[in-house]
């Protein structure tokens, strides 16, 4: 009951998939499948994704575009890149804030919230690593300050103040005993 010859397009190629009756070419990124092709290996009818939706893949057969994600304001997120027909919204943190992942195994799609970056200057410390993907890494005390306990203390401005050993080493004062 079947013929011996077989037409070239057999749905095995990357760009063809059996949709309805025929093997059809896929739609380009930013478009959705409105109607399948009407002949073997023909072009599907593809329409541009409506506003606030997208499809990032090439040669796909999706009949619906995905809804663009909204950045979570409660988590202090902002849109770094607005959604387009070919790409989802890219959410991130505004300058001076860093991403704090909400799961231990953090990947690009993991839920996150934004935390304000540590201000090393306000702590009178050098900034060793700028805050971006993680919190700021502060270094040693700024000139005119010395380590005391967990913080940096200002060098005394007169000989009247006490200046312990670490102070003397940093501030250039001799012990006044």
């Amino acid at each position: 009951q079947g013929g011996t010859r077989s037409p070239r397009c057999d749905c095995a190629g990357d760009f063809h998939k059996k949709i309805g009756l025929f093997c059809c070419r896929g739609c380009p990124a930013g478009h959705y499948l409105k109607a399948p092709c009407t002949e073997p290996c023909g072009n599907s009818t593809c329409l541009v994704c409506p506003q606030d939706t997208f499809l990032a893949w090439e040669n796909h057969h999706n009949s619906e575009c995905a809804r663009c994600q909204a950045c979570d304001e409660q988590a202090s997120q902002v849109a770094l890149e607005n959604c387009s027909a070919v790409a989802d919204t890219r959410c991130g943190c505004k300058p001076g804030w860093f991403v704090e992942c909400q799961v231990s195994q953090c990947v690009s799609s993991s839920p996150f919230y934004c935390q304000p970056c540590l201000d090393c200057g306000a702590l009178h410390r050098h900034t060793r690593l700028l805050c971006s993907r993680r919190d700021t890494d502060c270094g040693t005390c700024l000139p005119g300050f010395y380590e005391h306990g967990d913080g940096c203390v200002s060098c005394p401005t007169s000989t009247l103040g006490s200046c312990p050993e670490r102070c003397a080493a940093v501030c250039g004062w001799r012990q006044m005993f």
Epitope: P7, R8, C9, D10, L21, P40
Partner: antibody, heavy 123, light 111 residues
Framework: EVQLVESGGGLVKPGGSLKLSCAAS????????MSWVRQSPDKRLEWVAE????????YYPDTVTGRFTISRDNAKKTLYLEMSGLRSEDTAMYYC????????????????WGQGTSVTVSS | DIVLTQSPASLAVSLGLSVTISCRAS??????????LQWYQQKPGQPPRLLIY???TVESGVPARFSGSGSGTDFSLNIHPVEEDDSAMYFC?????????FGGGTKLEIK
């Protein structure tokens, strides 16, 4: 033995509606695409609708698009053709036909036809 | 849409002779070596019956006296030898592209 039995035809006024049915037996109905073909009084054959095996995709010629709707119920092994906005030129014998794939995903042949149901559109 | 033109519209042939019916398409209905053309027979009061598909493949159960040929845009159905039972309408049909279309038909009478 493959059997297709149409029903639901009759006399209807212009602008009216009608729903045709086609009961299938003797084959795995859900595995085949199905068509409706009509034959006008002058004996011309015209394909009017097609539905894929999984019932996801439907196809129509421009002459009936927006007026006719093909559907199927694989559990009941029944094919339907809902017709609305009927015109005098829709007067015909309506046949349902099974579409066999002669070549995978490419060529379809109407290998079995029902006896037909007559539709007359007249005031 | 692909238009199929059949000729002749009708003909009468003597029993035992050979008959050829033609079908011409408005554009090629071939794809990668396969011609997407079918032939159907219809007797009065009956639905069409598939005789040939892919231009030349004879459907199961169809007598060997029916044969089909052609490619591209020109096709023909040949019956040899013609029998009394062959008195009927014959239609060609393309399945290269939707919408499927049929030829206008050829009425064959046996003398």
């Amino acid at each position: 033995e493959v059997q297709l039995v149409e029903s639901g035809g009759g006399l209807v006024k212009p602008g009216g509606s009608l729903k045709l049915s086609c009961a299938a037996s003797g084959f795995t109905f859900s595995s085949y695409a199905m068509s409706w073909v009509r034959q006008s009084p002058d004996k011309r054959l015209e394909w009017v609708a097609e539905i894929s095996s999984g019932d996801t995709y439907t196809y129509y010629p421009d002459t009936v698009t927006g007026r006719f709707t093909i559907s199927r119920d694989n559990a009941k092994k029944t094919l339907y053709l809902e017709m609305s906005g009927l015109r005098s030129e829709d007067t015909a014998m309506y046949y349902c036909a099974r579409d066999r794939e002669a070549y995978y995903g490419q060529q379809y042949v109407m290998d079995y036809w029902g006896q037909g149901t007559s539709v007359t559109v007249s005031s | 849409d692909i238009v199929l033109t059949q000729s002749p519209a009708s003909l009468a042939v003597s029993l035992g002779l050979s008959v050829t019916i033609s079908c011409r398409a408005s554009e090629s209905i071939e794809y990668s070596g396969t011609s997407f053309l079918q032939w159907y027979q219809q007797k009065p009061g009956q639905p069409p019956r598939l005789l040939i598909y892919g231009s030349s493949t004879v459907e199961s159960g169809v007598p060997a006296r029916f044969s089909g040929s052609g490619s591209g845009t020109d096709f023909s159905l040949n019956i040899h030898p013609v029998e009394e039972d062959d008195s009927a309408m014959y239609f060609c049909q393309q399945s290269r592209r939707l919408p499927w279309t049929f030829g206008g038909g050829t009425k064959l009478e046996i003398k």
